[in-house]
Interface confidence: low
């Protein structure tokens, strides 16, 4: 049979902690599309038991042979059928787990029923919350049978299925009429293709006699061993907390396999791990019972004691399932020379010994560096050796050093020294670093300096909204990679902490210091469009735009105008910091340049969609500056300006522009057009008496040219006349004192 196990964690008080893990012991299982074959699949099967839609479940792959399903948010998410598919080609196998709600009206006395062809199957639904209505039995989602509510026997509704055949296999349910399907009792019936003890195409071959509750596979005759047992006939017990065809897997968590349901390939079905029983696999076996679901009885002989995980533990000189078989200087076997554990853990150390008389649990002891002697808490007795398991008290740093395993029997004694290294779990010394942020995600560099011992095996990032009392969200990341925290709230501060782990049980260090990381604003979604633009000079452009009208407040802090000069390959960006603005003056542009122009809304650091672009051609630059500008006061209100035309003109001058400003004044300058470009002088009238003025001027062809030098002159005092002739031009007159 394929080595495939589906584990369900039955911590039902908190669905968010519930998880399903599919573990494959097959070589190269789950590596995907390479030569090793197809990956492991783990999914909820909604074909028969449908539950209300909820948030999608999270699937996490841990290496090549393990996949875990999490993300259950409410108890109803758990109810139903889950399946794991693994193995390649003809060995592709589906393992099924059926989950019942602990609060259902009806509960199955036993969820998985494996029966032989021709047997009578009896499904028993126990009344948990009574309703005085009929009970509907369904098979694979279809109506099968109805029982009147009076037909309950001893608080149970029974469905008898005589002479079952393989097509009868499937999911059965018992539901009160008009009750929620989630309150049903769900069962799984597995009908072997052969009668008891037989296998093969015509059921002609005899099964090997599977021990410890193993089930003979009707296709290949192999024993599908219960969790915690191994061997061709399931004759050998694994160490406590181990499972898989070679006992190679270990139950997660500090409670071993407590609270875990194990599902194996058909025809085994599901059960608790060895040593546990009950609907939630949280009850230890009663004395004298052992194995999966505690279904086996020890019946130990010759002074053997019953271990709920492995069965009979035989005294010296005896072995066999019931210590019924009678059996040199003792010898320590296969002791590792060096072991490593984490500080404050309580590891189990195994020491195996053989000899005649056969070593028993009490004859093997473990000695710590300080001389303390530990006695084993459990022993697994096999025909050729006894393996004593020692539960070491919580390790401290002083426990580092040489330990010794010693076996003593009446035949003599043997000992073996080995080195134990106690390592300190790593603790971050700094907070994680924020790399980039968006409105709904943060990219974080999690690896920081730490105290304690490496190597770092896993990095956990814990995060939650600042000042929140909600549970921390946790993400396990590769130590060498940056991590993206997804599905966050915009514009929200998050407290983020790192927890580092080193290899081995108890390798998780304390949480590092928190840091505050804030998500960005929501992205602005409105697309502006350009209403128009107006050239206000060879280097000046006024732009106006609009936004679509939408209900609600505007999401935006301002606008970004972008001008692209394709000839020079240069981009100019202008920030308009008011979201109410709809116009902007762009200055300092390059005359005679063809620009591509667009505008977009921004919010915090995020840009919205850009408007459709506009193409704008600025006029070329104007003429050089007029030469030799000179000013002379004519009266208390008039000053005459004279100049020479600019040299090297690119074309005919259309006008001159004079700038007039009171010296030291705070007001804006006044511009006056001189519309007769052939003139080289003009009189500025309407000035104030005894006032000092500044003048400069420039010429215009297609665009305004460079400014001339600035000249100063004062108007005369009242009643004084300047000497010499007066030459007037038709310059526009305007008083500066209005």
């Amino acid at each position: 049979a394929v080595d495939l196990t589906l584990l369900a964690n039955l911590r039902l008080t908190d669905p968010q902690r519930f998880f399903l893990t599919c573990v494959s012991g097959e070589a190269g299982a789950g590596r995907g599309s390479d030569a090793w074959g197809p990956p492991l699949l783990l999914e909820k099967d909604d074909r028969i038991v449908r539950t209300p839609p909820g948030p999608p479940l999270r699937l996490a792959r841990n290496g090549s042979h393990q996949v875990t399903l999490r993300g259950f948010s409410k108890p109803s998410d758990l109810v139903g059928v889950f399946s794991c598919v693994g193995g390649a080609g003809a060995r592709r196998t589906r393992v099924i787990y059926v989950h019942n709600s602990p609060g259902a009206h009806l509960l199955p006395d036993k969820v998985t029923h494996t029966v032989n062809k021709g047997d009578t199957a009896v499904l028993s639904a126990r009344v948990h919350k009574e309703k005085q209505t009929d009970v509907i039995w369904k098979s694979n989602g279809s109506y099968f049978y109805t029982l009147d509510w009076h037909e309950a026997q001893d608080g149970r509704f029974l469905l008898q299925l005589p002479n079952v055949q393989p097509p009868s296999s499937g999911i059965y349910s018992a539901t009160y009429l008009e009750a929620s399907p989630l309150g049903s009792a769900f069962f799984r019936l597995i009908v072997r293709g052969c009668g008891a003890g037989r296998w093969g195409p015509g059921c002609t071959k005899e099964c090997p006699g599977c021990l410890h509750g193993g089930v003979c596979h009707d296709h290949d005759g192999e024993c599908v061993c219960p969790p915690g047992f191994t061997g061709t006939r399931c004759e050998q017990a694994c160490r406590e907390g181990r499972f898989g065809q070679s006992c190679q897997e270990q139950c997660p968590g500090i409670s071993g396999c407590r609270g875990l349901t194990f599902c194996l390939p058909d025809p085994y079905g599901c059960s608790c791990g060895s040593g546990w029983r009950g609907s939630q696999c949280q009850e230890a076996c009663a004395p004298g019972h052992f194995g999966a679901d505690c279904r086996l009885q020890c019946q130990c002989q010759n002074g053997g004691t019953c271990d709920r995980f492995s069965g009979c533990v035989c005294p010296s000189g005896w072995h066999g399932v019931h210590c019924e078989k009678s059996d040199r200087i003792p010898q320590i076997l296969n002791m590792a020379s060096e072991l490593e554990f984490n500080l404050e853990t309580m590891p189990r150390i195994n020491c195996a010994a053989a000899g005649n008389p056969f070593p028993v649990r009490g004859s093997i002891e473990l000695r710590k560096p300080d001389g303390t002697v530990l006695l084993s808490t459990k022993a697994i007795v096999e025909p050729e050796k006894t393996t004593a398991e020692f539960e070491v008290p919580r390790l401290v740093l002083a426990d580092s050093g040489f330990w010794e395993c010693r076996v003593s029997t009446s035949g003599g004694q043997d000992s073996r020294r080995f080195k134990v290294n106690v390592k300190v779990p790593p603790v971050p010394l700094a907070a994680p670093r924020l790399l980039t942020k968006q409105s709904r995600q943060l990219v974080v560099s999690p690896l920081v300096s730490f105290s304690g011992d490496g190597p770092i095996s896993t990095v956990r990032l814990h995060y939650r909204p600042q000042d929140s009392t909600m549970d921390w969200s946790t993400i396990v990341v590769d130590p060498s990679e940056n991590v993206t925290l997804m599905n966050l709230r915009p514009k929200t501060g998050y407290s983020v902490r790192v927890q580092l782990s080193r290899p081995g049980e108890g390798g998780e260090g304390a949480w590092g210091p928190p840091t505050l990381m804030t998500t960005d604003c929501p992205e602005p979604l409105l697309q502006p469009w350009l209403e128009g633009w107006h050239v206000e000079g060879t280097d000046r452009l006024r732009v106006s735009w609009s936004l679509p009208l939408v209900p609600g407040p505007l999401v935006g802090d301002g606008f970004l105008l972008r001008l692209w000069d394709g000839t020079r390959g240069q981009e100019r960006r202008e920030n308009v910091s008011s979201p109410q603005a709809r116009t902007a003056l762009l200055t300092g542009l390059t005359p005679g340049t063809h620009y591509q122009l667009d505008v977009q809304l921004y919010h915090c650091t995020l840009l919205g969609p850009a408007s459709p672009p506009a193409h704008v051609l600025l006029p070329p630059s104007g003429p050089p500056a007029p030469r030799h500008l000179h000013a002379q006061a004519l009266s208390d209100s008039e000053i005459q300006l004279t100049w020479k035309h600019p040299e090297a003109l690119p074309g005919p001058i259309s006008k001159y522009v004079v700038e007039v400003q009171v010296a030291g004044g705070a007001g804006d300058p006044l511009w006056i057009d001189v519309d007769r470009p052939e003139e080289t002088s003009t009189i500025i009238r309407g000035l104030n008496a005894s006032t000092r003025y500044l003048f400069r001027m420039r010429a215009s062809i297609q665009g305004l040219g460079d400014w001339s030098n600035t000249v100063e002159e004062s108007t005369l005092g009242n009643g004084l006349q300047a000497e010499g002739p007066v030459q007037e031009s038709r310059a526009a007159e305007e008083g500066l004192d209005q």
Partner: antibody, heavy 117, light 110 residues
Amino acid sequence: EVQLLESGGGLVQPGGSLRLSCAASGFTFSSYVMMWVRQAPGKGLEWVSRIYPSGGITQYADSVKGRFTISRDNSKNTLYLQMNSLRAEDTAVYYCARDVYRAFDIWGQGTMVTVSS
Amino acid sequence: QSELTQPPSASGTPGQRVTISCSGSSSSIGLNPVNWYQQLPGTAPKVVIHSNDQRPSGVPDRFSGSKSGTSASLAISGLQSEDEADYYCAAWDDSLNGPAFGGGTKLTVL
């Protein structure tokens, strides 16, 4: 005889500082996780801080984080609690305790800290 | 506010059996062993039960502890006057990354 003896308590004004000591004897001090636990007058027990045998790892309750510092001197078999920025709500009997598999098997007799103006 | 919940008081007559409950969460009692402390008036606490049901040497066998799921209880049979004290439950809390104490139960021997 295995025992723990606290000292250093007293009356201090809000915002002030105190340093508590806990002298250990009768066991290998350097091998154990040590704790400080406090009990406000008429109230229940509250964990304050915890330190690993080497002193390299420390843990604090949220209520004292950033204000209190736990430390140890294994050569002197002594545990310390440096308390800064004291508040009225820090008024309590402070016990040191030995932590064995997260059970506190040995306790000192306690030292009273009163924060009042 | 305590992370573990205990009744504030309990009482019984000499010779009676009394039980004190302690309720926690999946991250505290659900995952970790429970310890019980006795605090006689004016003295430091003393552990009477550790690791759910283990009695330290010197503690009478009248004291017993048990745990189921996210709850635990301390039972005292054959109640005696010297048992009058405050009793606190405690368990490591994985979400706090520290120990959590119950608020305490004052046991009165009538």
